[in-house]
């Protein structure tokens, strides 16, 4: 008789999850010499240990501490790029501007990017059928708690000028409920961070509005200012040209506003 299995509202664990995490770790340590000391076997086992045999609605940041310890990494604290609802462009940017880093350019972010995972209480099985949805089921699920944990640590590490890329095509350009709005903004350290600079990315080619005047951006400015951090904002009217100019800053067309 098949054992009753909890049905959650979200998609199940990504297929070949263990193999994917292990392979990503191996690949990352090959590409990043500063992380070559990392033992990927121990990293995978600590990752697995954070959620296996635990109720997938009862995961805590503490569960991920062994993984955090193994994945400890120093990135230049003044070269951090945060993003909200515009991951692809942020990643394209750091692929060109190699001295800047998103969370997914770090080992732990790279391991988990675009993956889903969860286990079941009291069994060593990974649940490939379904996992809890943040809204419909519970917020303390393995994926959400992981990203909350690594995002908090990433924000805490930032210093000097921190950049954030925001999606100007969304109804809420700054969303208080996003990981950026609910975690990262509140964990920037005022004693280390001088300025948060927002880059608002425009979607339409003919969109010439100043989206830095958007009410949600003003709300972000207010939150940041209350935390004794300066705020600045720039419109990126042409993201394609923006990337092109990052690649070729000497190009004559790159002196005008992008």
């Amino acid at each position: 008789v098949p054992r009753w299995r909890q049905q959650w509202s979200g998609p199940g664990t990504t297929k070949r999850f263990p193999e994917t995490v292990l392979a990503r770790c191996v690949k990352y340590t090959e590409i990043h010499p500063e992380m070559r000391h990392v033992d990927c076997q121990s990293v995978w086992d600590a990752f697995k240990g954070a959620f296996i045999s635990k109720h997938p609605c009862n995961i805590t940041e503490e569960d991920y501490q062994p993984l955090m310890k193994l994945g400890t990494q120093t990135v230049p604290c003044n070269k951090i790029l945060l993003w909200s609802r515009i991951k692809d462009l942020a990643h394209q940017f750091t692929q060109v501007q190699r001295d800047m880093f998103t969370l997914e350019d770090t080992l732990l972010g790279y391991l988990a990017d675009d993956l889903t995972w969860c286990g079941e209480f009291n069994t060593s099985k990974i649940n490939y059928q379904s996992c809890p949805d943040w809204r419909k089921d519970c917020s303390n699920n393995p994926v959400s708690v992981f990203w909350k944990t690594v995002s908090r640590r990433f924000a805490e590490a930032a210093c000097d000028v921190v950049h954030v890329m925001l999606n100007g095509s969304r109804s809420k350009i700054f969303d208080k409920n996003s990981t950026f709005g609910s975690v990262e903004v509140h964990n920037l350290q005022p004693e280390k961070v001088q300025t948060l600079e927002a880059w608002v990315i425009h979607g339409g080619r003919e969109d010439s509005r100043d989206l830095c005047q958007d009410p949600t951006i003003k709300e972000l400015e207010s939150i940041i200012s209350k935390r004794n951090i300066q705020f600045s904002c720039k419109n990126i009217y042409r993201p394609d040209k923006f990337l092109q100019c990052v690649k070729n800053p000497e190009d004559s067309s790159c002196t005008s506003e992008i």
Epitope: P18, E19, L22, A23, C25, V26, K27, T29, E30, R36, H37, V38, D39, C40, Q41, S42, W44, D45, A46, G49, P66, K69, L70, S124
Partner: antibody, heavy 112, light 112 residues
Framework: SLEESGGRLVTPGTPLTLTCTVS????????MAWVRQAPGKGLEYIGI?????TTYYATWAKGRFIVSKTSTTVDLKITSPTTEDTATYFC??????????WGPGTLVTVSS | DIVMTQTPASVEAAVGGTVTINCQAS??????LAWYQQKPGQRPKLLIY???TLASGVSSRFKGSGSGTEFTLTISDLASADAATYYC??????????FGYGFGGGTEVVVK
């Protein structure tokens, strides 16, 4: 450094525990393994224990061996030795780089 | 479990000559492959890790290449001290469904 001990002559079926004493290695962040080599034969993995403490075994070794550790030692228990388990047993450290540290090995002879 | 197939089992070459040893993995192990030299009564000595990186203190006459599933060790300008058995080794990692650690069967190099 790594140093194996506990190898001796045992009769078939008598459980035997080998101990690897470690110095200068943080066992909470490194994977340790046991490898063996029968006389005149090749090297073979028995099992590993990761920094996190999870154990994995080669298929042929499951149920026949148990790997465990403390903060300074890694043990290998041969649950019910047979004459085929006569070999030199090596304790090794495995990293993402390679199996870079080997103990000198300890000889186990199983004979009636 | 991963299977490492090493060829040839034995090879003979003259001093000053070149020897090539091949190793095939049963699954993609990226560049997580090492080569070892072992002489009778001694523990294995690491020559190459990460498929092509020379271990500290090892002669540049030893060259490793390959990635994925196909790997090669080339020993050039053969010296009498190179007479030994050579092993390839995967250290890719283990999950509950696969054990990615394993050795090839070994290649005995005889120097004339």
């Amino acid at each position: 450094s790594l140093e194996e001990s506990g190898g001796r002559l045992v009769t078939p079926g008598t459980p035997l525990t080998l101990t690897c004493t470690v110095s200068g290695i943080d066992l909470s962040i490194y994977t340790m393994a046991w490898v063996r080599q029968a006389p005149g034969k090749g090297l073979e993995y028995i099992g590993i224990i990761s920094g996190y403490g999870t154990t994995y075994y080669a298929t042929w070794a499951k149920g026949r061996f148990i790997v465990s550790k403390t903060s300074t030692t890694v043990d290998l228990k041969i649950t019910s030795p047979t004459t085929e388990d006569t070999a030199t047993y090596f304790c090794v450290r495995t990293t993402v780089q390679s199996t870079d540290l080997w103990g000198p090995g300890t000889l186990v002879t199983v004979s009636s | 479990d991963i299977v490492m197939t090493q060829t040839p089992a034995s090879v003979e070459a003259a001093v000053g000559g070149t020897v090539t040893i091949n190793c095939q993995a049963s699954q993609n192990i990226y560049s997580n492959l090492a080569w070892y030299q072992q002489k009778p009564g001694q523990r294995p000595k690491l020559l190459i890790y990460k498929a092509s990186t020379l271990a500290s203190g090892v002669s540049s006459r030893f060259k490793g290449s390959g990635s994925g599933t196909e790997f090669t060790l080339t020993i050039s300008d053969l010296a009498s001290a190179d007479a030994a058995t050579y092993y390839c080794q995967s250290y890719y990692g283990a999950t509950s469904s696969s054990f990615g650690y394993g050795f090839g069967g070994g290649t005995e190099v005889v120097v004339k």
